[in-house]
């Protein structure tokens, strides 16, 4: 029976609730009132219904038999729940149309609703309350009000905001003022005077955040109210003038030929004026730019001084100006609360230059073009040019230099690298270009001392060709010995040149000799399939690095074709 009664009660409670909510004028969430309060400080929040939404006050509503009900929705929850007014020490209470927190806690953050109702009338509004934390220097995510002070304007004051109604006039609170993190005492031109902070003469250096901490007693407890505002020192109205148009002016004439681009900047200086809207605009022949059948674009940029004086620039541009456009009147207008000004730009058609300048320009243009072409040709074909010069005018390096080999090949002893060296490199350099290669594993005699033989071979070679790959840089390998010997030889005696061929990319290496070599020497990169063609860039770069040699070499197109196909099969 009891269970049945509970179910029936709940059912009717639900009906009543839905019926009431349907009849209630819901003003929604009043996001204009983004209330932020500090954690662990008192907060008093008036129900916004009487301030913005209804045409009567709380006293009138109360005397008419209307009741004010409060409830809230916690942050990230959808459930509306009553406010607990039975917390210890009366932490949350309601007094007339004010909701009190003495003090707030972080989890008080949420949307609060106040509802005014009786049996026939209902009106409600919600507002967000955010409880925020502050650090020891009063820094917090709270949005700070900005107070503007006029520069060098005499005594000006700021007042500790939003502290009314927290304590009766009989209570004398203590007020401490801070600039940033520092307590204001013995400041030159800033003097705390209770709830006010006086600036004897405001200067740019006074820009910053100012905090007042109000401490007051209540029922044997001590509460603190912290209020921070930003002070911005701005231009004084004493110095304010109507807008000043710097350009266009009488000294600059915009002289253009038909077909050229016409650019006229309008640069205007505006003194700072509280709540003044600064505007700059153009007229053409006294009309709006859109009313003229020409393709006009106007771009605006704005900059501010430290005292918030403003410079606006509007650039009027006509891509291809006509002789008619050059006869028009272009006027820049500027307006602020101090007045409106206008200035016309001096625009005129350029007198055509004498005829010979065209020929001169053409000649100069042709010369420049020729130089550019030569530079491009050199840039693209420099390898071919060097090789052509060497083939016809270069002196043979190999005569009487006492060397046995043209190239000593140093590489990582690894199947892939060996295949590249023995088939690809040897195939082209020996068979195509007629160079004599020394490959240790092929040319050394068994049973010899590796170190001695390596050094001997390197001394007998005109070039040391290093095939770089990740395997190459492994410590203690034969390849590293070859590299060190070659670099030593090159540095001390200068009778061998080192050529670096990057077979595969080498990431950051700890081998200092290789690091140094890579910074000093040009690295010729093998690009796989792209590099196989013997007439390609890779082989030409390699040829340039090789010793000049007047030896008969097979280079008929047939054989090149053959060797390319044989390379493709590698």
């Amino acid at each position: 029976m009891t269970l049945l009664w509970c179910v029936v009660s709940l059912y009717f409670y639900g009906i009543l609730q839905s019926d009431a909510s349907e009849r209630c004028d819901d003003w929604g969430l009043d996001t204009m009132r983004q209330i932020q309060v500090f954690e662990d400080e008192p907060a008093r929040i008036k129900c916004p219904l009487f301030e913005h939404f209804l045409k009567f006050n709380y006293s009138t509503a109360h005397s008419a038999g209307l009741t004010l009900i409060w409830y809230w929705t916690r942050q990230d929850r959808d459930l509306e729940e009553p406010i607990n007014f039975r917390l210890p020490e009366n932490r949350i209470s309601k007094e007339k149309d004010v909701l009190w927190f003495r003090p707030t806690l972080l989890n008080d953050t949420g949307n609060y609703t106040c509802m005014l109702r009786n049996t026939t009338y209902c009106s409600k509004v919600a507002f967000p309350l955010e409880v925020v934390q502050k650090d020891s220097c009063f820094n917090s995510p709270m949005k700070l009000p900005v107070h503007k002070l006029y520069i060098e304007y005499g005594i000006q004051r700021i007042t500790c905001p939003n502290v009314d109604g927290y304590f009766p006039s009989s209570v004398k609170p203590t007020i401490t003022w801070y600039m940033g993190c520092y307590k204001i005492q013995n400041f030159n031109n800033v003097i705390p005077e209770g709830m006010n902070l006086s600036f004897l003469i405001a200067l740019i250096s006074n820009n910053g955040n100012y905090t007042c901490v109000v401490t007051y007693p209540e029922n044997g407890r001590t509460f603190h109210l912290t209020r921070t505002l930003t002070v911005k020192v701005v231009g004084s109205p004493k110095n304010a003038v109507p807008p000043v148009i710097h350009s266009p002016n009488d000294h600059v004439v915009y002289e253009k030929e038909p077909g050229e681009e016409l650019l006229i900047p309008c640069t205007v200086y505006f003194s700072f004026l509280m709540d003044s809207r600064n505007e700059v605009w153009w007229t053409i022949d006294g009309k709006k730019p859109d009313d003229i059948t020409i393709d006009v674009t106007i771009n605006e940029s704005i900059s501010h001084s430290r005292t918030e004086d403003e410079t606006r620039t509007q650039i009027l541009s006509i891509k291809k100006v006509t002789s008619e456009d050059l006869k028009r009147s272009y006027v820049c207008h500027a307006r602020s609360a101090k007045g409106e000004v206008a200035k016309a730009a001096k625009v005129k058609q350029k007198v055509p230059a004498p005829r010979y300048t065209v020929e001169l320009a053409c000649g100069f243009g042709a010369t420049v073009l020729l130089v550019v072409i030569l530079i491009v040709v050199y840039h693209v074909y420099w390898l071919e040019m060097v090789l052509f010069y060497r083939a016809h005018f270069g002196t043979d390096e190999t005569i009487l230099d006492g060397k046995e080999y043209d190239i000593y090949v140093s590489y990582a002893r690894n199947a892939e690298e060996e295949e590249f060296v023995l088939l690809t490199l040897r195939g082209v350099l020996e068979n195509e270009f007629g160079y004599k290669l020394c490959i240790f594993d092929r040319d050394s005699l068994p049973g010899g001392i590796v170190t001695d033989e390596t050094l001997s071979f390197i001394q007998k070679s005109r070039r040391l060709l290093v095939v770089l790959s990740p395997n190459y840089v492994l410590q203690g390998t034969q390849a590293l010995l070859e590299l060190k010997a070659g670099l030593e030889n090159m540095a001390s005696r200068g009778n061998i040149n080192v050529i670096l061929v990057q077979y595969k990319a080498v990431k950051e290496t700890k081998v200092k000799e290789l690091k140094r070599a890579k910074t000093v020497l040009t690295v010729i990169k093998w690009k796989g399939e792209k590099s196989k063609y013997p007439q390609g860039r890779f082989w030409k770069q390699l040829q340039v690095a090789m010793p000049v040699k007047k030896s008969p070499r097979r280079s008929s197109s047939d054989e090149q074709g053959l060797s390319y196909s044989s390379l493709k099969n590698v």
């Epitope: 809207r277 605009w281 709006k288 859109d290 605006e300 000004v341 206008a342």
Partner: antibody, heavy 118, light 113 residues
Framework: QVQLFQSGAEVKKPGASVKVSCKAS????????VHWVRQAPGQGLEWMGW????????DYAQKFQGRVTMTWDTSISTAYMELSRLRSDDTAVYYC???????????WGQGTTVTVSS | DIVMTQSPDSLAVSLGERATINCKSS????????????LAWYQQKPGQPPKFLIY???TRESGVPDRFSGSGSGTDFTLTISSLQAEDVAVYYC?????????FGPGTKVDIK
């Protein structure tokens, strides 16, 4: 040709918000102010405010301060006017109009009827 | 705010006759720096948005017939329709755009007698 096209009629309950759009075509959207003017049934014209789509600056009539928000979207050449906390006396035809700075409102939208009724 | 008043509230004029509408501002809308009064006139027909007629007191908007003319300076302004046509039946509003909030006059209804 130059046109301002407004969104369709709206019926709202007291306390709700309404957002009216105004799409511009045939001119450089950022080169002109967009004004919002309303006209209650059988009444005169009432200026609500303006927005400069070039700078984003706004100026609202004191009467609507705190209730009106004017925004814009340059990419689609559209201005918006949102009026919150609607009351029955907000029932009116809402017009958008453009002006080249101080040249008066030369082009008007067709109007959007907003009815506020419980 | 600048308050705009218009007189008369309504007037009936025979076709082809002159119609004159007066507009008064509570303070001057004249910018001395360019000697321009920032006053506009609009025409509104039933069920239509207002139509821009005149700006800067006397400058006709392109496409507006020359029978419409504006005059005045400072605080007193006049819109004149030199020869009323049937299509001119409408409500006429003056508006100041000297300073925000821009304000309109209450309107003058023009009918045919």
């Amino acid at each position: 040709q130059v046109q301002l096209f407004q969104s369709g009629a709206e019926v709202k309950k007291p306390g709700a918000s309404v957002k009216v759009s105004c799409k511009a075509s045939g001119y450089t959207f950022t080169g002109y102010y967009v004004h919002w003017v309303r006209q209650a049934p059988g009444q005169g014209l009432e200026w609500m405010g303006w927005i400069n789509p070039n700078s984003g600056g706004t100026d609202y009539a004191q009467k609507f301060q705190g209730r009106v928000t004017m925004t814009w979207d340059t990419s689609i050449s559209t201005a918006y006017m949102e009026l919150s906390r609607l009351r029955s006396d907000d029932t009116a035809v809402y017009y958008c109009a453009r002006s080249y700075y101080y040249y008066g409102m030369d082009v008007w939208g067709q109007g959007t009827t907003v009815t506020v009724s419980s | 705010d600048i308050v705009m008043t218009q007189s008369p509230d309504s007037l009936a004029v025979s076709l082809g006759e002159r119609a004159t509408i007066n507009c008064k501002s509570s303070q001057s809308v004249l910018y001395s720096s360019n000697n321009t009064s920032y006053l506009a006139w609009y025409q509104q027909k039933p069920g239509q948005p207002p139509k821009f007629l005149i700006y800067w007191t006397s400058t006709r908007e392109s496409g507006v017939p020359d029978r419409f003319s504006g005059s005045g300076s400072g605080t007193d302004f006049t819109l004149t329709i030199s020869s009323l046509q049937a299509e001119d039946v409408a409500v006429y509003y003056c508006q100041q755009y000297y300073i925000t909030p821009f304000t309109f006059g209450p309107g003058t209804k023009v009918d045919i007698k």
